[in-house]
């Protein structure tokens, strides 16, 4: 074994090419330099080693950079970033978006794994924020990136990214993680004109408090039903059928389909049934006139 | 009401590993991060890491990557920390809290609402 | 990371004081503040937040002001059961970050 670890005579590596696919593991480690593999890692993705011969080359790479590899490093790893542990990950500075998406490209089609988001997690904070062009990059190789994060990651997320975001971006997205992006959204988008503003809103709505909901009721935006489902029920309840209907506009008549399913089950439950009947749709399970409805939740702001 | 409920003390030996539970009861368990604190014997709180069980996303203080890993089991509204390599700089009070927040204006406000009761960890031979 | 600081790590006042906690934080964090307090049991409980917002069943004796770097709790008028320690904590950005603690005696 000890022999072995001597480079054979004319079997220096004097450059990075495909000579070295037919080096054993221990010729590698003998033969190549770490240096001359580092200034040449852009040539190690055209060539088809094996793992072992990727493990070899890593071990070397690892060797020469205990502290972590320099960007002009990272930037070339290609295949061999299946390689890397998210420890290893954890000591690289990545301020580059160009190295972002070359190593998230080498994982394209797969699952998010622990090193891309490890990886993520460093060039976002090297950053200091997640601006418009990383959430752009990350959202096109994941499109439920923002919502595989957490409602404090959410939080950081400065306003003027929130252009980036697509709808299907959201589809993901539980009512908590709308609840914190919908306050950017709505001063991201707070000078566009009415019907404009409402499209780029549109998909932020299921984080919508109930006095926004009014007003758009004002605004003949005619909402959807899928729109109207995702509501936060606890913003939908106090609105009146008036208002329903004016922010649902001809799709009020998707009522009906919905009667039972939340918040429009809700909602019906705290409407008076003679108001719901001006609507024509049959709903039933309005409050019967004549009865008098009290709201406990006032009474409980009030004492 | 909200609750949460954590395992009992640990007698444990350097090297070994301890796995901490923190049972969540009284509210919507996915839609709250559960948020994890250490705390020395006699000493400050330090913020170790967040476990959010809607989107199954994980954050960790970067002084304890290396240290504590969290998981959750939905079915029973728990989320775990557990705690490998144990030293004597491990021996602390570790507290579970919820973290509320809610919208206020453009921004988003944070708090720790609700704590367990801590679970102390001994580290000793 | 946000460092946190609580110079006085002990404060001796007597019933019925006004006593007053600080905080300074490293940089900016916009009012990102929160109080929290530890009772002897070591039972922890949320006080204030965001610097000034009294949170359900604090009494109003407690409040919070400051703003940038400086941020202070106030007790009005001191009772027995208010003998704890006192952390302040800022959540501006990841990792959150505690102050070392206030304790609080009776004189």
């Known amino acids: 074994e000890v022999e072995k670890t001597a480079c054979p005579s004319g079997k220096k590596a004097r450059e990075i090419d495909e000579s070295l696919i037919f080096y054993k593991k221990w010729e590698l480690e003998a033969c190549v330099d770490a240096a001359l593999l580092a200034t040449q890692m852009d040539r190690v993705n055209a060539i088809p080693f094996t793992y072992e011969q990727l493990d070899v080359l890593k071990h070397k790479l690892d060797e020469l950079y205990p502290q972590g590899y320099p960007e002009s490093v990272i930037q070339h790893l290609g295949y061999l970033f299946l390689k890397m542990s998210p420890e290893d990950i954890r000591k690289w500075n990545v301020t580059s978006l160009e190295t972002l998406k070359a190593l998230l490209e080498v994982n394209k089609g797969h699952e998010m794994s622990p090193q891309v988001a490890t990886l993520i997690d460093r060039f976002v904070k090297g950053r200091g924020q997640l601006d418009k062009d990383t959430l752009d990059t990350l959202t096109a190789f994941y499109p439920g990136y923002l919502c595989s994060l957490s409602p404090e990651e959410l939080s950081s997320v400065p306003p003027s990214s929130i252009w980036a975001v697509r709808p299907q971006d959201l589809d993901t997205c539980d009512p908590r993680q709308l609840d914190v992006l919908y306050p950017k959204a709505r001063l991201a988008f707070q000078n566009m004109n009415g019907s404009e503003y409402f499209v780029k809103i549109q998909s932020f709505l299921g984080g919508a408090p109930t006095e926004d909901l009014k007003a758009l009721s004002q605004q003949n935006v005619s909402m959807d039903l899928a729109t109207f489902m995702k509501l936060r029920t606890d913003a939908v309840l106090p609105l009146t059928v008036a208002e329903v209907q004016k922010l649902l506009g001809p799709h009020v008549e998707g009522l009906k389909a919905e009667e039972r399913h939340r918040p429009v089950r809700d909602w019906i439950l705290r409407q008076r049934q003679d108001d719901l009947d001006t609507l024509g749709l049959g709903l039933q399970g309005g409050i019967p006139n004549g009865y008098l409805v009290l709201d406990l939740s006032m009474q409980e702001a009030l004492s | 009401q909200v609750q949460l409920q954590q395992s009992g003390a640990e007698l444990v030996k350097p090297g070994a590993s301890v796995k901490l539970s923190c049972k969540a009861s009284g509210y919507t368990f996915t839609l709250y991060s559960i948020h994890w604190i250490k705390q020395r014997s006699g000493q400050g709180l330090e913020w170790i890491g967040l476990?959010?069980?809607?989107?199954?996303?994980?954050k960790y203080n970067e002084k304890f990557n290396d240290k504590a890993t969290l998981t959750a089991d939905k079915s029973s509204s728990t989320v775990y920390m557990e705690l490998s390599s144990l030293t004597s700089e491990d021996s602390a009070v570790y507290f579970c809290a919820r973290h509320e927040g809610h919208s206020y204006g453009h921004t988003y406000l944070w708090f720790f609402d609700v704590w367990g009761a801590g679970t102390t960890v001994t580290v000793s031979s | 990371d946000i460092q946190m600081t609580q110079t006085t790590s002990s404060l001796s006042a007597s019933l019925g004081d006004r006593v007053t906690i600080s905080c300074r934080a490293s940089?900016?964090?916009?009012?990102?503040l929160n109080w929290y307090q530890q009772k002897p049991d070591g039972t922890v409980k949320l006080l204030i937040y965001?610097?000034?917002r009294l949170h359900s069943g604090v009494p109003s004796r407690f409040s919070g002001s400051g703003s940038g770097t400086d941020y202070s709790l106030t007790i009005s008028n001191l009772e027995p059961e208010d003998i704890a320690t006192y952390y302040c904590?800022?959540?501006?950005?990841?990792?959150?970050?505690f102050g070392s603690g206030t304790k609080l005696e009776i004189r």
């Open positions: 940089q900016d964090i916009s009012n990102y």
């Open positions: 476990f959010y069980p809607g989107s199954g996303s994980i």
């Open positions: 965001y610097t000034s």
């Open positions: 904590q800022q959540y501006s950005q990841l990792p959150y970050t």
